[in-house]
């Protein structure tokens, strides 16, 4: 339905807090060096306008798009050049095009100062001195380090993040109260970063028809009693909402989604169980929770997928009738009987049936050709079972830590012209798989593990994409999106590496280790060993993990010294000697 | 200087047990890596197990992960190999090796070596 003034409609469908909070995070999003306060000017600016636009959709302007209002005030800031660069140009550019130019000089990685958290009664004294502008600068500043993040699931961590405040400031032990609520919220604010980020790249690197298979799978895994045409109308729907969150448009995005969780709710009878508690939450909850519901239990007594799909004789005809609905049919039958499978290995299925169907079905005798495909599937289902079951054992033997530190070293020597900051984080992130995951019992490792890793796995492939140094991620990034992570596994060591120059100050520690916390620590240690490999590719296993703890009882000897900056200083030199010696540096 | 003896050597059947010792003179035992290395006649001596100076982290040849246990008591001054499942191949002269770094230790270039002790599994 064509509104006068689009503007108008969004202000009035979102409410003014919703709408104001969504512009912050659209042009904190854009624009990721601008200072807070231009930031909320503008949006003032903005807000003041959609208001006349509201009192009359026919004033001046108000019939402008989106991204033209949206456009034309970004381009207003006076140091866009200088801050930005060449981002500056696409002021230059009509819509749709300026859009499309700030979206491509989104930063994954911005040079932003860490975000450092201040003492809980100086948080507590700006929480209540001016609850808005500190709610307001908690949306910048996620959304300007995050500038995928799920817009208007950010505006549900800013609701939890007020209600902790509200709560501890007013606790006995402060502190106590807020800090395990900033950390929960810190952590599962990073996932949901990196979940969206992958929706976004799913989208704009391998396009809609890539991004609805995906959905198809987990939408059918998660609502099995749901009928097809069920399922393939909220594919759709959440393929729209994404498609403009990615896009920059996140008003709509905002209100389509509220309209998704509103028809959920409304048809959930013909859609899962499971949705009762989430619907009867206010609409933030209410759709953080549907996004997050359990899989419903499956239809008792479901048939054979071989009669549909291998057996009956029209499989060409339906097939050549409408292929993308009969492989999304497929795709929804095979992903409703397996919640056991992870997404990317039911796409991968779909993969092959779709080849095998392309095959065969030009074949002399089609039948026969097709007949055996479920076969083909049993070595793709094997694959990510064995590997994560050797992975789990690993994790179990190892412990966190160590796990991160073997992985760290596997993908070091499989790719070590990345960054050394990009691979202790990427394997950092790689290892948390095992806590996350081993845990569960085995129906639900796979679709924990493997869709988990899929999330990581496209933090190095952005990443990496900002500043391209090896093909071989480049290769494994762009060929297949299903197939990415079975690309990355199967990398051996790269034998055309050049061992980087040894620098003795890469190796050289100081007394502010030992004030550090325990994450921080390991971080240090991380990039220690990612450095020793990339100057040391053939070293063993074993020379690294003695090397570490060469390096860990250093650090301890060092922390309890009462000189620890000499101790640091001639430790230091002597155990990179004992190094350079045994390994040859 | 650092003294290291080993004993518990002798001949096994297959499938059984033994329990390596090596004892060391000197009063900074504790912040020495110790490690196991053995010799097969006409072979190359190789790396079978170690044990850090913190918090016991221990490493193992992987021939050898999961049948082996090294141990350290620093009271005691001796550090263990206790070898479980005991196949043919494991037939060497067992050396036991110490020194400041675990680094050094596995890529066989400690400071001090004991004069080992013989194992023999037989079939």
């Known amino acids: 339905d064509a509104h006068k003034s689009e503007v108008a409609h969004r202000f009035k469908d979102l409410g003014e807090e919703n709408f104001k909070a969504l512009v912050l995070i659209a042009f904190a999003q854009y624009l990721q060096q601008c200072p807070f306060e231009d930031h909320v000017k503008l949006v003032n600016e903005v807000t003041e306008f959609a208001k006349t636009c509201v009192a009359d959709e026919s004033a001046e302007n108000c019939d402008k798009s989106l991204h033209t209002l949206f456009g034309d005030k970004l381009c207003t800031v006076a140091t866009l050049r200088e801050t930005y660069g060449e981002m500056a140009d696409c002021c230059a550019k009509q819509e749709p095009e300026r859009n499309e130019c700030f979206l491509q000089h989104k930063d994954d990685n911005p040079n932003l100062p860490r975000l450092v958290r201040p003492e809980v009664d100086v948080m507590c004294t700006a929480f209540h001195d001016n609850e808005e502008t500190f709610l307001k600068k908690y949306l910048y500043e996620i959304a300007r380090r995050h500038p995928y993040f799920y817009a208007p699931e950010l505006l549900f961590f800013a609701k939890r993040y007020k209600a902790a405040f509200t709560e501890c400031c007013q606790a006995a032990d402060k502190a106590a109260c807020l800090l395990p609520k900033l950390d929960e919220l810190r952590d599962e604010g990073k996932a949901s970063s990196a979940k969206q980020r992958l929706k976004c790249a799913s989208l704009q690197k391998f396009g809609e028809r890539a991004f609805k298979a995906w959905a198809v799978a987990r939408l059918s895994q998660r609502f099995p009693k749901a009928e097809f045409a069920e399922v393939s109308k909220l594919v759709t729907d959440l393929t729209k909402v994404h498609t403009e969150c990615c896009h920059g448009d996140l008003l709509e995005c905002a209100d389509d989604r509220a309209d998704l969780a509103k028809y959920i709710c409304e048809n959930q009878d013909s859609i899962s169980s499971k949705l009762k508690e989430c619907c009867e939450k206010p609409l933030l909850e209410k759709s953080h929770c549907i996004a997050e519901v359990e899989n419903d239990e499956m239809p008792a007594d479901l048939p054979s997928l071989a009669a549909d799909f291998v057996e009956s004789k029209d499989v060409c005809k339906n097939y050549a009738e409408a292929k993308d609905v009969f492989l999304g049919m497929f795709l929804y039958e095979y992903a409703r009987r397996h919640p056991d499978y992870s997404v990317v290995l039911l796409l991968r299925l779909a993969k092959t049936y779709e080849t095998t169907l392309e095959k065969c079905c030009a074949a002399a005798d089609p039948h026969e050709c097709y007949a055996k495909v479920f076969d083909e599937f049993k070595p793709l289902v094997e694959e990510p079972q064995n590997l994560i079951k050797q992975n789990c054992e690993l994790f179990e033997q190892l412990g966190e830590y160590k796990f991160q530190n073997a992985l760290l070293v596997r993908y070091t020597k499989k790719v070590p012209q990345v960054s050394t900051p990009t691979l202790v984080e990427v394997s950092r992130n790689l290892g948390k798989v095992g806590s996350k995951c081993c845990k569960h019992p085995e129906a639900k490792r796979m679709p924990c593990a493997e869709d988990y890793l899929s999330v990581v796995l496209n933090q190095l492939c952005v990443l990496h994409e900002k500043t391209p140094v090896s093909d071989r991620v480049t290769k494994c990034c762009t060929e297949s999106l299903v197939n990415r992570r079975p690309c990355f596994s199967a990398l051996e060591v790269d034998e055309t590496y050049v061992p980087k120059e040894f620098n003795a100050e890469t190796f050289t520690f100081h007394a502010d280790i030992c004030t550090l916390s325990e994450k921080e620590r390991q971080i240090k240690k991380q990039t220690a060993l990612v450095e020793l490999v990339k100057h040391k590719p053939k070293a063993t296993k074993e020379q690294l993990k003695a090397v570490m703890d060469d390096f860990a009882a250093f650090v301890e000897k060092c922390c309890k010294a009462d000189d620890k900056e000499t101790c640091f200083a001639e430790e230091g030199k002597k155990l990179v000697a004992a190094s350079q010696a045994a390994l040859g540096l | 200087q650092v003294q290291l003896v080993e004993s518990g050597g002798g001949l096994v059947q297959a499938g059984g047990s033994l329990r390596l010792s090596c004892a060391a003179s000197?009063?900074?035992?504790?912040?020495?890596?110790i490690g196991w290395f053995r010799q097969a006649p006409g072979k190359a001596r190789e790396f079978v197990a170690r044990?850090?100076?913190?918090?016991?982290?221990?490493d193992y040849a992987d021939s050898v992960k999961g049948r082996f246990t090294i141990s350290r008591d620093n009271a005691k001054n001796t550090v263990y190999l206790q070898m479980n499942s005991l196949k043919p191949e494991d037939t060497a002269v067992y050396y036991c090796?110490?020194?400041?770094?675990?680094?050094?230790?596995?890529?066989?270039?400690?400071?001090?070596w004991g004069e080992g002790t013989q194992v023999t599994v037989s079939s």
């Open positions: 090796a110490a020194d400041s770094y675990n680094v050094r230790l596995v890529t066989g270039e400690a400071d001090y």
């Open positions: 044990v850090s100076t913190i918090a016991g982290d221990t």
């Open positions: 000197g009063r900074t035992f504790s912040s020495y890596a």
